[in-house]
Each structure stands twice: as structure tokens, then as C-alpha cells.
């Protein structure tokens, strides 16, 4: 039993990190292997991950972390019964992938204007909590090629546009997700869409 | 819940030796690095010494370097500090203290056991 | 070895007065920084890890913050059973080391 592809992990800087690697062949990840992990600097026990199937030779594991400062480096150590198979180490703060924004809602009833908000993924004391830009992603459902990005690079998650941008009468949907320059974090996932019926007064046109 | 019980002290001349004990309850006690700190009468803290989960590693204060070892014994859930060539200046109230895991942070504590050296 | 260095070692105060303690290292700790509160006859009992990471108990009065070399417990509001001494640890490298301890009174 070998590693083909070398553990690679993200974190979510506040709880979670995912670890992702792949067998040289069809392995029940969650019998056969497991991940432990550890803060360098403690002298404890590691910590266990049971590592779940992810295609036919690939596994996934969710490592809890109880807090994320910047200089957190684990170590990882991924065992196959009494085998040591890899060893390697990992540090959270230069892998971030920040959570995906919750509860995306479109406020269709202030004038003309759609004001779309969500909310921030992280807590007011997490460091990501201020740190955060977005991305707004709108399409239409009837007209694939009516796609378009707003980026929101102000601390305010909320987007305010014109309904006229948009075309009146047919319906559109929106995500949102989030991303930090800080950390040079990737992108989160697209938070669930949402869905709404675009229809504005169109001005009357004078002759 | 967890529990830390320091015992052992006492009064010793200078030169003399001494072991304190720390039994632990309501942990694992196996599964975590484990410490000494100790307090000077009417002064600060001071960080005595670690030793891992396994007993394979083990730090010191300089101070203590050499003269202090530590040790523990999983099967007895019991923590050791064995203090050689006591000074005067190892007078103090020592307590054996629980490492977190990347949360929990040096608690609880127990209630110290005091060495007094004096001749 | 990393020397902390707290200021002030001592000041009074009065309920409900917000209360500043500093600690210093004498390099980068990484923020691997925690606080004690110590009353007289007690054993110390853990308030902050990770420079601003509230032990689970203790009342959001407490904070911590800081980065780098500086770092700072804050009391919102001064409660009776606040007044104690504080202790900072850095837990970057051994030999793990405590500040010298700051000693708040009643005014």
C-alpha cells in the first residue's frame, strides 16, 4: 500500500482543515488508514482523523481545530496500521479557504433598487471576520449568456444594484462567496442560490 | 472532571532531595504532555518543566537543568518531579499542570504541594 | 530564553473602570500568549490562550490582543472579583517563561 498523491490541505481558519490525498489503488480509506495530527510545539498525544472514501483510491479527512493563529504548524503522520505511509507537515494560515457566505437573501421592495445581503461566514473574533471580500455571481435562469460577477471588495456584505441592470419580467438567481487578500486565501465555495423575479416600472418615455 | 493532586512536600536541608507526586483524574491522563510550575512565597510564576504524553520528551527551566528530572507513570495516571541538590531558591509552591490540546489552555491547576529548603 | 515583561506591576482601580495590562517579549512569540488570574492562597486559573482565545467560563469582560512582540489584556468593566494578580506565558519555545505578574488593587 503506497500514497500516490501526497496529502494536500486547506483550512477554513477557524475550526476545520480538509486533507486530500490519493492510494496507488481502490483502498477503504476509513478501515485502513489514519491521519493523526498535532501542534508542533505540543507534547500530547496526536489527534485522529478516520478518513472517508473519495473515490475509488482517493481519501478525505476533516481535521477539528479548536483555534487558528497565524504560526500554527502541525504535524501530519499517516499511518496504515503499524506502516508509517507519509510524513509530512502543515501549516493552516498558508491554506486558507474561507468559508462559504450564509443566508444570501434579495430585498426586492426598496424602489427600483435590489439589495442583495448575506452573512459573514466567521465570527467577530476570528481574524477573517474584517478581512473578507466577495463575489456576487447573477444570472438568469431563462438566457445563460445574461451571467454577470460583482465584485464587493468594501467589508459590508451587501450589494445594492439598479433592477434596471437586470432584464424586467423573467427570473434570475444569485450566489455569493468569499475570499481574503491577507491570507492570499482561494476562493470559497458559492454559497446556495437564491432566487427572485426581477420586475421594475420601466420610465415612461417622453415624445 | 479533571482533577490534579500535588503531594510530596515538605521541609529538606540544602543538598538534600525530594519527589513530588501529582495524581490526575477525569483525563486521559496518557494522552497529554504534562508540567511543572512553581511560585516562590509572595513571588511570580516560573515554568519548571514539561515532559510529553509518552515520556520520550522532556524540557527544563534552566534553573532546574540537571538537577530536577521528570517522569511519569501512565499505568498510575501519576506525574514525577524528582529535585536533587536542593537550593534555598527552590523554595516554592509547585504545581503539576495539564497541557491543552490546541484549545484549553493550562487548566485547571491543582493546589500546589510547598518545599521548603532550609537548614 | 524569551523574557516577558509586564507593565504596570501594580495599579488601584475602581469597579467598573476599564483596566489595560501589558506584556512585552523580548522577541516574536507568534502569538502563542496566555493569561493567569491569580488570587491570594490560589492556585492560578487560565483566562486567555492564543493571545485573544477566551478559556471556556471566563466572562467576555476579558480580551486579549496583540501580535508580534506586544500584547494586552483589557477588563471592560472591573468587577469585585476581579482584583488579583495577572500573569502573561509565552508558549512559543522552551523554556516556556511568565511575565513578573501585575498586581490590581482596589482604589
Known amino acids: 500500500m503506497k500514497v500516490l498523491q501526497e496529502p494536500t490541505c486547506v483550512s477554513d481558519y477557524m475550526s476545520i482543515s480538509t486533507c486530500e490525498w490519493k492510494m496507488n489503488g481502490p483502498t477503504n480509506c476509513s478501515t485502513e488508514l489514519r491521519l493523526l495530527y498535532q501542534l508542533v510545539f505540543l507534547l500530547s498525544e496526536a489527534h485522529t482523523c478516520i478518513p472517508e472514501n473519495n473515490g475509488g483510491a482517493g481519501c478525505v479527512c476533516h481535521l477539528l481545530m479548536d483555534d487558528v493563529v497565524s504560526a500554527d504548524n502541525y504535524t501530519l503522520d499517516l499511518w496504515a496500521g503499524q506502516q508509517l505511509l507519509w510524513k509530512g507537515s502543515f501549516k493552516p494560515s498558508e491554506h486558507v479557504k474561507p468559508r462559504a457566505p450564509g443566508n444570501l437573501t434579495v430585498h426586492t421592495n426598496v424602489s427600483d433598487t435590489l439589495l442583495l445581503t448575506w452573512s459573514n461566514p466567521y465570527p467577530p473574533d476570528n481574524y477573517l471576520y474584517n478581512h473578507l471580500t466577495y463575489a456576487v455571481n447573477i444570472w438568469s435562469e431563462n438566457d445563460p449568456a445574461d451571467f454577470r460577477i460583482y465584485n464587493v471588495t468594501y467589508l459590508e456584505p451587501s450589494l445594492r444594484i439598479a433592477a434596471s441592470t437586470l432584464k424586467s419580467g423573467i427570473s434570475y438567481r444569485a450566489r455569493v462567496r468569499a475570499w481574503a487578500q491577507c491570507y492570499n486565501t482561494t476562493w470559497s465555495e458559492w454559497s446556495p442560490s437564491t432566487k427572485w423575479h426581477n420586475s421594475y416600472r420601466e420610465p415612461f418615455e417622453q415624445h | 472532571q479533571v482533577q490534579l493532586v500535588e503531594s510530596g512536600g515538605g521541609v529538606v536541608q540544602p543538598g538534600r532531595s525530594l519527589r513530588l507526586s501529582c495524581a490526575a483524574s477525569g483525563f486521559t491522563f496518557r494522552s497529554y504532555g504534562m508540567h511543572w510550575v512553581r511560585q516562590a512565597p509572595g513571588k511570580g510564576l516560573e515554568w519548571v518543566a514539561v515532559i510529553s504524553y509518552d515520556g520520550s520528551q522532556t524540557y527544563y527551566a534552566d534553573s532546574v537543568k540537571g538537577r530536577f528530572t521528570i517522569s511519569r507513570d501512565n499505568s498510575k495516571n501519576t506525574l514525577y518531579l524528582q529535585m536533587n541538590s536542593l537550593r534555598a531558591e527552590d523554595t516554592a509552591v509547585y504545581y503539576c499542570?495539564?497541557?491543552?490540546?490546541?484549545?484549553?489552555?493550562?487548566?485547571?491547576w491543582g493546589q500546589g504541594t510547598l518545599v521548603t529548603v532550609s537548614s | 530564553d524569551i523574557q516577558m515583561t509586564q507593565s504596570p506591576s501594580s495599579l488601584s482601580a475602581s469597579v467598573g473602570d476599564r483596566v489595560t495590562i501589558t506584556c512585552r517579549a523580548s522577541?516574536?512569540?507568534?502569538?502563542?500568549l496566555a493569561w493567569f488570574q491569580q488570587k491570594p492562597g490560589k492556585a492560578p486559573k487560565s483566562l486567555i490562550y492564543?493571545?485573544?482565545s477566551l478559556q471556556s467560563g471566563v466572562p467576555s469582560r476579558f480580551s486579549g490582543s496583540g501580535s508580534g512582540t506586544d500584547f494586552t489584556l483589557t477588563i471592560s468593566s472591573l468587577q469585585p472579583e476581579d482584583f488579583a494578580t495577572y500573569y502573561c506565558?509565552?508558549?512559543?519555545?522552551?523554556?516556556?517563561?511568565f511575565g513578573q505578574g501585575t498586581k490590581v488593587e482596589i482604589k
Open positions: 506565558q509565552q508558549y512559543n519555545s522552551h523554556p516556556w517563561t
Open positions: 492564543a493571545t485573544s
Open positions: 522577541q516574536a512569540i507568534n502569538n502563542y
Open positions: 499542570v495539564k497541557e491543552g490540546r490546541s484549545g484549553s489552555w493550562f487548566d485547571p
